[in-house]
Amino acid sequence: SEVEYRAEVGQNAYLPCFYTPAAPGNLVPVCWGKGACPVFECGNVVLRTDERDVNYWTSRYWLNGDFRKGDVSLTIENVTLADSGIYCCRIQIPGIMNDEKFNLKLVIKPAKVTPAPTRQRDFTAAFPRMLTTRGHGPAETQTLGSLPDINLTQISTLANELRDSRLANDLRDSGATIRIG
């Protein structure tokens, strides 16, 4: 399923994605990518978490919520029109073919008031049409050893009617829930 979110040029965009850990600290690897979710992982990864921490991120992309409680919503700082497109949130639930993936569409609108000049983005993240070079940076860095016994009960993403980044604060009360197992 795909839900559309909006932000204005120069603002921060918010793309919600949640899961519920079985217990605090029993985290699940999550990746965010620019582009739709492929068969495995995320294409063009912009941020990753592992069982303990955020282990890979790129400029302007961060997690503003408490990811240790399952809030892995992505914040994109100071967006430009080039940030428009599909983003993949993939929750890599341990086991065989257990991943939950969400495609979220970000629409960037021109600013109503021209913002002050800001620093240009470091690279083009649009996938793959504006891609010019390929890197082999970290794809995933997860903790070794035995995996915690995670029995996820739900994964939440934003309900269809929540279309605007400013509604982020209402998310917890309005999220759609997917139950696993």
Epitope: V28, P29, G35, A36, P38, V39, F40, E41, G43, N44, V45, D50, E51, G85, I86, Q92, I93, P94, G95, I96, M97, N98, D99, N103, K105, F127, P128, R129, L131, R134, G135, H136, G137, P138, A139, E140, T141, Q142, T143, L144, L147
Partner: antibody
Framework: DVQLVESGGGLVQPGGSRKLSCAAS????????MNWVRQAPEKGLEWVAY????????YYADTVKGRFTISRDNPKNTLFLQMTSLRSEDTAMYYC???????????WGQGTTLTVSS | DIVLTQSPASLAVSLGQRATISCKAS??????????MNWYQQKPGQPPKLLIY???NLESGIPARFSGSGSGTDFTLNIHPVEEEDAATYYC?????????FGGGTKLEIK
């Protein structure tokens, strides 16, 4: 340079078992998902299994589900494929392949040959 | 599963000319205009080698005479001008849906 070296192939009887290994070097093995892809003699390519970097997520092709097990040992930079209940149709060259940033198989080993025959 | 049908199964192209290989998917491998379609080259006795990723992006170190295009269900690999060393079998592969699948291959012979 990225290097993937498979081993463990050979002749196995139908119903038998075999464990393939893939030794990785030249990159941070623990940061990449890995795959096994096979190629029957004079045939095309068939994806077999995928494992995420931390082993949390695993996918199998329907043709091997329940018979093959993919695993990895990150400290030893090694990928494995445990194969059981082998059939003649499992006869193939088995390649390990790294899962790339852009949802592709970006590096491949030279392969190891498995022959299932009585 | 997404079935990828390559054509022709084999072709012979004169040195310096253009080789065109088609790959048709049984369903779209696009999502909002982004295509998870890749192309590989395999020479006898060697493993496959990634040439093109995401439909049209040239892998690092691959000569610019290789190019990919297409969207939806129809994709094309072009090689121009063809060189002797391009004699090989070429495979398309989709990463849009589980399981990842490959085309049947196209064998390129250089005349």
């Amino acid at each position: 340079d990225v290097q993937l070296v498979e081993s463990g192939g050979g002749l196995v009887q139908p119903g038998g078992s075999r464990k393939l290994s893939c030794a990785a070097s030249g990159f941070t093995f623990s940061s990449f998902g890995m795959n096994w892809v096979r190629q029957a003699p004079e045939k095309g390519l068939e994806w077999v299994a995928y494992i995420s970097s931390g082993s949390s997520t695993i996918y199998y092709a329907d043709t091997v589900k329940g018979r093959f097990t993919i695993s990895r040992d990150n400290p030893k930079n090694t990928l494995f494929l445990q194969m059981t209940s082998l059939r003649s149709e499992d006869t193939a060259m088995y390649y390990c392949a790294r899962w790339g940033r852009w949802a592709d198989f970006d590096y491949w080993g030279q392969g190891t040959t498995l022959t299932v025959s009585s | 599963d997404i079935v990828l049908t390559q054509s022709p199964a084999s072709l012979a192209v004169s040195l310096g000319q253009r080789a065109t290989i088609s790959c048709k998917a049984s369903q779209s491998v696009d999502y909002d205009g982004d295509s998870y379609m890749n192309w590989y080259q395999q020479k006898p006795g060697q493993p496959p080698k990634l040439l093109i990723y995401a439909a049209s992006n040239l892998e690092s170190g691959i000569p610019a005479r290789f190019s990919g295009s297409g969207s939806g269900t129809d994709f094309t690999l072009n090689i121009h001008p063809v060189e002797e060393e391009d004699a090989a079998t070429y495979y398309c592969q989709q990463s849009n849906e589980d399981p990842p699948t490959f085309g049947g291959g196209t064998k390129l012979e250089i005349k």
